[in-house]
């Protein structure tokens, strides 16, 4: 018979044969041949793996790193990685939670909605036409432009979402 | 590892004052939005106090406004949080933070007891 050109769901081609993939958990030690069966062993102790696979090496589960304020929120298992949290107050930088902030900073162009709580981060908004703010902050929100009007001044620059308003000299029409 | 340094907590009276320090040994503040955050026996951490890199902005919690005042001394290195009028509430580990408000920044902090 004709070698196989592709396998079904769970199997691997190799040396034109179908071979059955390691279930997860496990990792494989050696190929199938014509008369023998795929070769897995489980995953060790703090390792794993999280699908039907052909890897030779299981990965390590995550260290939730306490000198980054990481606690372990759920333990690895031989199929799945170490879920980690922040400590009590404190906020993940990413979904993937590497690292811990106290609270995020609401960056320029964007005001704090609301401050942060041991419970939620910082809320941020974009600031409205008519407010900038231009700095990194976790408390403060978009202030509005300069209102030149009420300095006798004129808008000599206009103001965006990260800039105040520039205002200057009204031009004085010669006699 | 480069750690924030509060100091000036201490055993304090009802109606009492204390100013709290926050140093940092190694690397710069000027410029940097600060915090000074607490954390009272059995609670959560409290955002107490903020001011801007620039020191024109501040920012007081409900619960101290009117009583504490925030400030810095770029030249110094330092934060200062001038604590009046002190209540038993008030009682806790004061820690400084420092934009972008990392763990590994984070210092042992400084306790304050408020009590007669």
């Known amino acids: 018979p004709e070698p196989p050109t592709a396998c079904r769901e769970k199997q691997y081609l190799i040396n034109s044969q179908c071979c059955s993939l390691c279930q997860p958990g496990q990792k494989l030690v050696s190929d199938c041949t014509e008369f023998t069966e795929t070769e897995c062993l489980p995953c060790g102790e703090s390792e794993f793996l999280d699908t039907w696979n052909r890897e030779t090496h299981c990965h390590q589960h995550k260290y939730c790193d306490p000198n980054l304020g990481l606690r372990v929120q759920q333990k690895g298992t031989s199929e799945t990685d170490t879920i980690c949290t922040c400590e009590e107050g404190w906020h993940c930088t990413s979904e993937a939670c590497e690292s811990c902030v106290l609270h995020r900073s609401c960056s320029p162009g964007f005001g704090v909605k609301q401050i942060a709580t041991g419970v939620s981060d910082t809320i941020c908004e974009p600031c409205p036409v008519g407010f900038f703010s231009n700095v990194s902050s976790a408390f403060e929100k978009c202030h509005p432009w300069t209102s030149c009007e009420t300095k006798d001044l004129v808008v000599q620059q206009a103001g965006t979402n990260k800039t105040d308003v520039v205002c200057g000299p009204q031009d004085r029409l010669r006699a | 590892e480069v750690q924030l340094l509060e100091s000036g907590g201490g055993l304090v009276q009802p109606g009492g004052s204390l100013r709290l320090s926050c140093a940092a040994p190694?690397?710069?503040?000027?410029?940097?939005e600060m915090w000074w955050v607490r954390q009272a026996p059995g609670k959560g951490l409290e955002r107490v106090s903020?001011?801007?890199?620039?020191?024109?902005?501040?920012y007081y919690a409900d619960s101290v406004k009117g009583r504490f005042t925030i400030s810095r001394d770029d030249s110094k290195n330092t934060l200062y949080l001038q604590m009046n009028s002190l209540r038993a509430e008030d009682t806790a580990v004061y820690y400084c933070?420092?934009?972008?408000?990392?763990?590994?920044?984070w210092g042992q902090g400084t306790l304050v007891t408020v009590s007669s």
């Open positions: 903020a001011i801007s890199g620039s020191g024109g902005s501040t």
């Open positions: 933070a420092k934009e972008p408000y990392s763990f590994d920044y």
């Open positions: 190694g690397f710069t503040l000027a410029g940097y």
